[in-house]
C-alpha cells in the first residue's frame, strides 16, 4: 500500500459513536487506529479536555511479524453509570511523529424522562403586577412539551398547547403555587413547586401635609394588597447628609434611620421631635400578612425655620459720657434657623422706646445726648431668623462708666435706623 501521504492522513479508522440513554446506563466508546510502527498511546478527550482518570483500555494487534509493520490499536472508554457529568463531546487524541491527530467526535447524552435545566423559583410579587416564570427541560428524546400548573390546576388543555419556556402571569391577588410538567416520549417529569407570595404594592404619592419647625405631617396612598388587608405601614426618616446624599431609590440608607410604625387607616403620620430648618429624606412601605411592600423612593423634605428659642446672653451695657456701649453673645438656645441678626430696644424711664435692627453685629455704640437727667435707661436684645424674633432678653440697665457722671439727654441716639418691624415692649 502506498504510504507517501500517511503522515498527513489521520491514522483513525474508527471514531467514538454516540451514546444516548437514561441515567445509570453503561456504555462503551471506541477509537480504532491503524498505524505503521510503534503504536501510540491513545488519550481520551471530553469537550476538548484530556480525561486524566478515564476508565479506558487499549488493545494493540500487530498485523505482521516485523516491528515496522502495521498495528491495529483499539481504545475503549467505558462509561459505567451514565450521569449528567458524562455528557459531552468525546474524541481520541494520539501523538504520531511530530503531529497530533484527533478523531472525529462522538457524543454522550442522556435520554429518558425530561431533565429540567430551569425550574420556577420562589419569589415575591406585588399584587396585581405582571411577572414571568421560567421553566426549561430537555430530552432526549425531543420534543419536550411543557404544561404549567397554577395551584395544581393545568393552565392549558394539553402539554405544548399553552405557554412553554416562559409563563407570563398578568397579576395575582393571592399567594399561589406554580409548577411545570415536562412531557416527552418517555414520560413526564414534574418540576419543583414555586411559591409566589403576593405582597402589597409600593405606596404611592408620599407627600407632606403640613410642616412645623420640629414636626412634619406626611400622607401617602396605599397600593393594592390583593386579598390581604394592610396591617400597618412603616415610615423611615433620615437626616439628609450632604456628604452622603441619599439617592432616589437607593436600596438602603447609609446610616440607621428613624423608623416609625403607623396604624392604617389613615395613611398619615405625624413625625415629631425633629430639628428645625433641617433637610430629611423619608420613605414608606406597607405590610400585609404576606409581608412588606417595597419602599417608596426617598422623598426629600425639610422642616421650616423657627424663631430662636432663647435670647442673646451675656449682655453688657455701659455708658461713658455721651456714648453707650452695648455688646452680647449669640443665644445658647437653638436658633431653629439661620440667624439673620439682632434687634435692640432701649428706653428711659420717661422716654419712648427706641427699636434698632443691629444686623449680625454683636455690639453697638449708641451716641447719647442729654444732661444726664434720663434715668433708668435699660437695653433689651433679641435674635431673629426668617421666622421671626426670638424672646427678648431681660432689660439690662445702662451702667455709668464713671460713677456720678451724667449728661443731659437731648437726643437719645445720634443715628438710628428705622425699625423694620414694630415691636411691643415686653
Amino acid at each position: 500500500a502506498p504510504r507517501g501521504t500517511q503522515a498527513e492522513e489521520s491514522p483513525f479508522v474508527g471514531n467514538p459513536g454516540n451514546i444516548t440513554g437514561a441515567r445509570g446506563l453503561t456504555g462503551t466508546l471506541r477509537c480504532q487506529l491503524q498505524v505503521q510502527g510503534e503504536p501510540p498511546e491513545v488519550h481520551w478527550l471530553r469537550d476538548g479536555q484530556i480525561l486524566e482518570l478515564a476508565d479506558s483500555t487499549q488493545t494493540q494487534v500487530p498485523l505482521g511479524e516485523d516491528e515496522q509493520d502495521d498495528w491495529i490499536v483499539v481504545s475503549q472508554l467505558r462509561i459505567a453509570s451514565l450521569q449528567l457529568s458524562d455528557a459531552g463531546q468525546y474524541q481520541c487524541l494520539v501523538f504520531l511523529g511530530h503531529q497530533n491527530f484527533v478523531s472525529q467526535p462522538g457524543y454522550v447524552g442522556l435520554e429518558g424522562l425530561p431533565y429540567f435545566l430551569e425550574e420556577p423559583e420562589d419569589r415575591t410579587v406585588a399584587a396585581n403586577t405582571p411577572f414571568n416564570l421560567s421553566c426549561q427541560a430537555q430530552g432526549p428524546p425531543e420534543p419536550v412539551d411543557l404544561l404549567w400548573l397554577q395551584d395544581a390546576v393545568p393552565l392549558a388543555t394539553a402539554p405544548g398547547h399553552g405557554p412553554q419556556r416562559n409563563l407570563h402571569v398578568p397579576g395575582l391577588n393571592k399567594t399561589s403555587s406554580f409548577s411545570c410538567e415536562a412531557h416527552n416520549a418517555k414520560g413526564v417529569t414534574t418540576s419543583r413547586t414555586a411559591t409566589i407570595t403576593v405582597l402589597p404594592q409600593q405606596p404611592r404619592n408620599l407627600h407632606l401635609v403640613s410642616r412645623q419647625p420640629t414636626e412634619l405631617e406626611v400622607a401617602w396612598t396605599p397600593g393594592l394588597s390583593g386579598i390581604y388587608p394592610l396591617t400597618h405601614c412603616t415610615l423611615q426618616a433620615m437626616l439628609s447628609d450632604n456628604e452622603v446624599g441619599i439617592q432616589a431609590g437607593e436600596p438602603d440608607p447609609p446610616e440607621e434611620p428613624l423608623t416609625l410604625q403607623a396604624s392604617v387607616p389613615p395613611h398619615q403620620l405625624r413625625l415629631g421631635s425633629l430639628h428645625p430648618h433641617t433637610p430629611y429624606h423619608i420613605r414608606v412601605a406597607c405590610t400585609s400578612s404576606q409581608g412588606p411592600s417595597s419602599w417608596t423612593h426617598w422623598l426629600p423634605v425639610e422642616t421650616p425655620e423657627g424663631v430662636p428659642l432663647g435670647p442673646p446672653e451675656n449682655i453688657s451695657a455701659t455708658r461713658n459720657g455721651s456714648q453707650a456701649f452695648v455688646h452680647w453673645q449669640e443665644p445658647p438656645a437653638p436658633l431653629q434657623g439661620t440667624l439673620l441678626g439682632y434687634r435692640l430696644a432701649y428706653q428711659g424711664q420717661d422716654t419712648p422706646e427706641v427699636l434698632m435692627d443691629i444686623g449680625l453685629r454683636q455690639e453697638v455704640t449708641l451716641e447719647l445726648q442729654g444732661d444726664g437727667s434720663v434715668s433708668n435707661l435699660t437695653v433689651c436684645v433679641a435674635a431673629y431668623t426668617a421666622a421671626g424674633d426670638g424672646p427678648w432678653s431681660l432689660p439690662v440697665p445702662l451702667e455709668a462708666w464713671r460713677p456720678g457722671q451724667a449728661q443731659p439727654v437731648h437726643q437719645l441716639v445720634k443715628e438710628t435706623s428705622a425699625p423694620a418691624f414694630s415691636w411691643p415692649w415686653w
Partner: antibody, heavy 120, light 107 residues
Amino acid sequence: EVKLVESGGGLVQPGGSLNLSCAASGFTFSSYSMSWVRQTPEKRLEWVAFISNGGGRTYYPDTVKGRFTFSRDNARNTLYLQMSSLNSEDTAMYFCARGTTESYYAMDYWGQGTSVTVSS
Amino acid sequence: DIVMTQSHKFMSTSVGDRVSITCKASQDVITAVAWYQQKPGQSPKLLIYWASTRHTGVPDRFTGSGSGTDYTLTISSVQAEDLALYFCQQHLSTPLTFGAGTKLELK
C-alpha cells in the same frame, strides 16, 4: 438518501483488465472511507480494497495486491477500481460500500453491484 | 489473516421464534464484529457493528453480543421478512474477512 451506483462490469478474458466505477451521492463523500467487496457465485463475501477519505491510504488483500488499484476523485464523488491480470477467481459481483464513522472497516451502505465475469 | 467461522450454513425457524446465529473468530477481535443481512437479489445490509451496536433503522428485535472470539446475532421474534442470508465480518484489521454465511429459512 445515500446512494452508490457501480458500473463498468462485464465479461473479460483471463489476463485482461477492467475498470469499475462507483458514483456516490446523498452524503459528504470526502468524509468517508470506502471499500470494494465482491461476492462469488457461491455467495461468499470477499473484501477487495480499502481507501481512506482523502485517498492517501489504500489497503488490499494479498489475493489482489499488485493487480488492483483503488482510487477516488472527491471532486466528482467517484471511486475507481482498476483491475488487471484478471483470472477466473475474480469472477464475482463487485459492490462498493461506505465505511461507518465508528469503524471504517464495517460497511453501512452498499451499492447494488456490478457483475464481472472472467472467462475465455 | 483472521478467519471467521459460521458453523451453521442453514438454520430453520418459525415466525415468532427466537433464533441465535453464531460466529467464531480465529483470534480475539476485541468486539470488532459486524453482522449483515442479505436478501435474494439485494446487496448486504448492515445490522450490527462493534458486536452490539445496532445500525440506524434496524429493528430492536436484532441484538448482537459477544466478546473475545465468540459472537452471536439474536433475533428475538423472527418475522417473515427476516428470512435471509446472514454474514458476520471482523472489522478489526485488514484484510477484512467474512464468515461463509448462515441462511435462515422456515421449518
